[in-house]
Interface confidence: medium
């Protein structure tokens, strides 16, 4: 019978940050500068990301794994690994599918992220409008007519409002 | 009332396409959300088709669907609808039409807030 | 292809059970927070529960909440009710060359 021999690949013993250069029989030689490899045995070793314009580096590159981009002030990470930036919305904004679009008539935002949510409505709680909503702000409740009588008690915060989670009619 | 209502043959031959028409009441096509198509086979999950921006008439389509599938809308019937080609025993499922919700100032949000009830749709000789 | 993968694939549950679904994602949604969760029952259409990756839509009880970011969300029931027996999916939307959507593999939560 024939014997059989070790099929095992000489690369396989090159580590993590190295890659088994064919042009030097094989040998396990370091990644050169600007690139990695983050698995043992590559052949090649793969060129680092680099972080430009809107994106900044948050984690350097090393030889065993690829530099990690996030955005600059006024935007914010999409996709994986961060391969987009978005602008911020504004307060008084929502990010939809079209972008940054002002809060309509009835609802608030006062983040840069998130969805606009309606304005407290002072009237289920036995309250009055103190101080008118805004696109970027939610309306201040205060008391009931019936209660500002001398002693009466001082603004109480809205209640926290919910999305209704549909479409407008 | 607001609803969606999907219509067509619920028997069609393989190799042949399969057409499906969504009737949308309750609400019109004046902003810029998407109507989107849903398919969940028997006994398993739900499975995104594709979907149309009613503001633009944009398509997008999973990547499985791209050259079988073409989603058109209507409006001036208030509908939009599904055509899947050469159609094979695996595409058999109950279909469903969705609307994307929409966000306070009108435009798509990325999730659906409103479903027809689905029309089941075998593929067989 | 984007994959949404959810956890467990079915569970036995009681009433007043705390019930935890997660759903992890082969790329991050758009915005890190464009995640929906839906409740089906046989027969019947899927029902919004949780948009944003943790907003209850309307008419959903507190029981229901939603939390995570980018790849990674949960669903809980704080106290499971008789009639949260259902299967219930995630649904992710995203944006690379084109926008996209994609539905999580389903969650059976049976008594």
């Known amino acids: 019978f024939e014997r059989t021999r070790s099929l095992q690949d000489p690369c396989s013993n090159c580590p993590a940050g190295t890659f088994c250069d064919n042009n030097r029989n094989q040998i396990c030689s370091p990644c050169p500068p600007n690139s990695f490899s983050s698995a043992g045995g590559q052949r090649t070793c793969d060129i680092c990301r680099q972080c430009k314009g809107v994106f900044r580096t948050r984690k350097e590159c090393s030889s065993t794994s690829n530099a990690e981009c996030d955005c600059t002030p006024g935007f914010h990470c999409l996709g994986a690994g961060c391969s987009m930036c978005e602008q911020d919305c504004k307060q008084g904004q929502e990010l939809t599918k079209k972008g940054c679009k002002d809060c309509c008539f009835g609802t608030f935002n006062d983040q840069k992220r998130g969805i606009c949510r309606p304005w407290t409505n002072c009237s289920l709680d036995g309250k009055s409008v103190l101080v008118n909503g805004t696109k970027e702000r939610d309306v201040v409740c205060g008391p009931s007519p019936a209660d500002l009588s001398p002693g009466a008690s001082s603004v109480t915060p809205p209640a926290p409002a919910r999305e209704p989670g549909h479409s407008p009619q | 009332q607001v609803q969606l209502q999907e219509s067509g043959p619920g028997l069609v031959k393989p190799s042949e396409t399969l057409s499906l028409t969504c009737k949308v009441s309750g609400f019109s096509f004046n902003n810029d959300y998407d109507m989107c198509w849903i398919r969940q086979p028997p006994g398993k999950g739900l499975e995104w088709i594709g979907c149309?921006?009613?503001?633009?008439?944009?398509?997008y389509y999973a990547s499985w669907a791209k050259g079988r599938v073409t989603i058109s809308v209507d409006s001036s019937k208030n509908q939009f609808s599904l055509k899947l080609s050469s159609v094979t025993a695996a595409d058999t499922a109950v279909y469903y039409c969705?609307?994307?919700?929409?966000?306070?100032?009108?435009?798509?949000?990325?999730?659906?807030?409103?479903w027809g009830q689905g029309t089941l749709v075998t593929v067989s000789s | 292809d984007i994959q949404m993968t959810q956890s467990p694939s079915s569970l036995s549950a009681s009433v007043g059970d705390r019930v935890t679904i997660t759903c992890q994602s082969s790329q991050s949604v758009y915005d890190n927070n464009w995640l929906a969760w839906y409740q089906q029952k046989p027969g019947k259409a899927p029902k919004l529960l949780i948009y944003?990756?943790?907003n209850l839509a309307s008419g959903v009880p507190s029981r229901f909440s939603g939390s995570g970011s980018g790849t990674d969300f949960t669903l809980t029931i704080s106290s499971l009710q008789p009639e949260d027996f259902a299967t219930y999916y995630c649904q992710g939307t995203y944006l690379s060359s084109n926008w996209y959507w994609a539905f999580g593999t389903g969650t059976k939560v049976t008594v």
């Open positions: 969705a609307r994307e919700a929409a966000s306070s100032s009108g435009y798509g949000m990325g999730y659906f807030d409103l």
């Open positions: 944003r990756a943790s």
């Open positions: 149309i921006d009613t503001g633009d008439g944009s398509t």
